[in-house]
């Protein structure tokens, strides 16, 4: 007989999302209601393709890069699913409330749905850290506090900092990391004897991943030009990033090579670096005057993550219980760390160019901006990790990470695992 | 030539609605950001509200916040302003504006480049 | 909150006018000059802070960064009379003018 639910998380689990879900509608009921103004039905189609290219990123992309674990990939493909239809809703929500709501009813665009997507995808890259070992009740919580810790924090910046929606949304990278990594530091770390195998890859679920980083690698410009203003700007930041990403395949599958004894190239450093040039490019992406400057940055972020999937897994496996196929979050925080330094540099730069006192105050801002970002999500994981340790999220037992038999019905299985 | 030209002003009382639309001739107006902008009889100007080139983002002076709406429709190359629950504060010429970006080294710097001849609104009992 | 000074003035054909604006924090270099006659619609001198736009003499310049900004009409012509705005865009979406300098003739 196969294995199911302890009986307290099949009651617990569908009580709380329905619950949950029951609230949301309410809100949206009483406190939402759409923008009436759009007299121009084809903008409206132009703009809900950049929508749309968000959504296949974060639904297909990031879906299918968490799937490669050999006995987790389904669990890894639906979750992502549930956690990115539930955080869209709530993005949506807090984002509106945050920002509109003094005005009576949030009103919703095409616009707050894109800022909600890359809101709910923050959640989705943090989550890498801890799928396998967590159940969709605590993903639940997780979806919750991240996504309000993520929109208080734009929030706060856009206020005190005076950055738009780009330069905000930016700090996605670095904070989706830290928020994952401190979330999978306070969950329970070692794995049994006999459950080794289970967090390694396979080659078909592998074959998945490389399909979702193929998604992500094609849809990356979108998600670089989504906020930006200007058609001159989304322009410059669809060709940077595109440089960008292009030579950090070249670079990843080079420097895997490179990286082996025997010449081999490594499934899991090439999923992960392919995406290298488009995070470190991020932040500054409408800003690189020329494409060569946005290659040379493809090409020292594929470096970069080749180098940390090398030397960083045993550490983060040792300290942080992440298993070594799960490096997007120590990889997105060096290159989200990177792209962050090369705005300061341009910073510094362009204060330099005027000629005045002002350089330490800017670059005092801009270094401002980044330590809120790292310490909101180091505070919030935190936050987030302890609240998924308590009992009542029944959450897996260590014997049971990163198994799909723990949360799927599979007919054709006569026992259990 | 590159040219805006605003209508629909008018004299309407407190509480009421008005609509103001601006044409936009002599460049591609599906690529430029749009903006309004007041200025009261006497007074300074007065930033009113903006809207993306594509119109997917919106954003209003606290103000009008909940009372103004800006859309566009770039198949007609026009900008729209609606107005309700008009108040005598209101009272102004409103131009439409189109702004322009020029990138610099760490952001972008926009500016309005072309302006409307302006259309009057008057809230009076 | 943009503040402008003098709020007035009076000068002399040839005489060299100077404009301050002050914001009241950093707006880097996003800062904009508008000429505006009676009647008229607003008129772009200057963006960034020191760029002049096209078709604008070149006795108007602009200078600062920061929070203090300054325009400069080196020789004061005749039709250079009128109201000048300064505007910044740094703080977007809520962009703000200062209150303006009306520039008479004397």
């Known amino acids: 007989m196969s294995s199911k639910y302890p009986r307290s998380v099949r009651r617990c689990l569908p009580l709380w999302a329905l619950t949950l879900e029951a609230a949301l509608i309410l809100l949206f009921y009483f406190f939402t209601h759409y923008d009436a103004s759009l007299e121009d039905q084809k903008g409206l189609v132009a703009s809900y393709q950049v929508g749309q290219d968000l959504t296949v990123m974060a639904a297909i992309g990031l879906g299918f890069l968490t799937s490669s674990f050999r006995r987790h990939s389904w669990s890894s493909v639906a979750f992502n699913l549930f956690m990115l239809a539930l955080g869209v809703q709530w993005a949506i929500l807090l984002d509106g409330f945050l920002s509109q709501f003094p005005s009576g009813k949030v009103v919703i665009t095409l616009f707050s749905i894109r800022l909600a997507t890359m809101s709910a995808l923050s959640v989705l890259i943090s989550v890498d850290a801890v799928l396998g070992k967590v159940n969709l009740a605590q993903l639940v919580v997780m979806v919750l506090v991240e996504v309000t810790a993520l929109g208080n924090l734009r929030m706060v910046i856009s206020n005190i900092f005076n950055t738009d929606y780009h330069m905000n949304m930016m700090h996605i990278y670095v904070f989706a990391a830290y928020f994952g990594l401190s979330v999978a530091w306070c969950l329970p770390k070692p794995l049994p004897e006999g459950t080794e195998d289970k967090d390694q890859t396979a080659t078909i679920p592998s074959l998945s991943a490389m399909l979702g980083a193929l998604f992500l690698w094609m849809f990356w410009p979108s998600f670089n030009s989504a906020l930006l203003r200007s058609p001159i700007e989304r322009k410059n930041a669809v060709f940077n990033t595109y440089y960008a990403v292009a030579v950090s395949v070249v670079t990843a599958i080079s420097g895997s090579s490179l990286a082996h004894p025997q010449g081999k190239i490594s499934k899991t450093y090439v999923h992960s670096a392919v995406l290298a040039g488009g995070v470190a490019v991020g932040t500054s992406c409408h800003l690189i005057p020329s494409p060569w400057l946005a290659m040379v940055l493809g090409l020292v972020a594929g470096l970069i993550s080749v180098g940390g999937a090398k030397y960083l897994p045993g550490c983060c496996n040792r300290v942080l219980g992440i298993p070594h196929s799960s490096i997007m979050g120590y990889n997105f925080s060096l290159l989200g760390l990177l792209g962050e330094i090369i705005y300061i540099v341009l910073l510094v730069l362009d204060t330099v160019g005027a000629g005045n006192g002002m350089i330490g105050f800017q670059v005092l801002l801009s270094i401002g901006e980044l330590s809120l970002a790292i310490v909101i999500a180091l505070m919030s994981g935190l936050l987030t990790g302890l609240l998924l340790n308590l009992k009542i999220w029944k959450a897996p037992h260590e014997a049971k990470y990163f198994d799909d038999q723990v949360f799927w019905k599979f007919p054709h299985l006569a026992v259990g695992f | 030539q590159v040219k805006l030209l605003e209508s629909g002003g008018g004299l309407v009382q407190p509480g009421g609605s008005l609509r103001l639309s601006c044409v936009a001739s002599g460049f591609t107006f599906r690529s430029y950001g749009m903006h309004w902008v007041r200025q009261a009889p006497g007074k300074g100007l007065e930033w009113v509200a903006f809207?993306?080139?594509?119109?997917?983002?919106?954003g209003y002076v606290d103000s009008v916040k909940g009372r103004f709406t800006i859309s566009r429709d770039n198949s007609k190359n026009m900008l729209y302003l609606q107005m309700n629950s008009l108040r005598a504060e209101d009272t102004a010429v409103y131009y439409c504006?189109?702004?322009?970006?020029?990138?610099?080294?760490?952001?972008?710097?926009?500016?309005?480049?072309?302006w409307g001849k302006g259309a009057t609104v008057t809230v009076s009992s | 909150v943009m503040t402008q000074s003098p709020s007035s003035l009076s000068a002399s054909i040839g005489d060299r006018v100077t404009i301050t604006c002050r914001a009241s924090q950093s707006v880097t270099r996003s800062l904009n000059w508008y000429q505006q006659k009676p009647g008229k619609a607003p008129r772009l001198l200057i963006f960034?802070?020191?760029t002049l736009q096209s078709g604008v003499p070149s006795r108007f310049s602009g200078s600062g960064s920061g929070t203090d900004f300054t325009l400069t009409i080196s020789s004061l012509q005749p039709e250079d009379f009128g109201t000048y705005y300064c505007?910044?865009?740094?703080?977007?979406?809520?962009?703000?003018f200062g209150q303006g300098t009306k520039v008479e003739i004397k």
């Open positions: 809207i993306w080139f594509d119109g997917s983002n919106k």
């Open positions: 960034a802070a020191s």
């Open positions: 504006a189109r702004e322009k970006a020029l990138r610099g080294i760490s952001r972008y710097n926009y500016y309005l480049d072309v």
């Open positions: 505007q910044q865009n740094y703080r977007t979406p809520q962009w703000t």
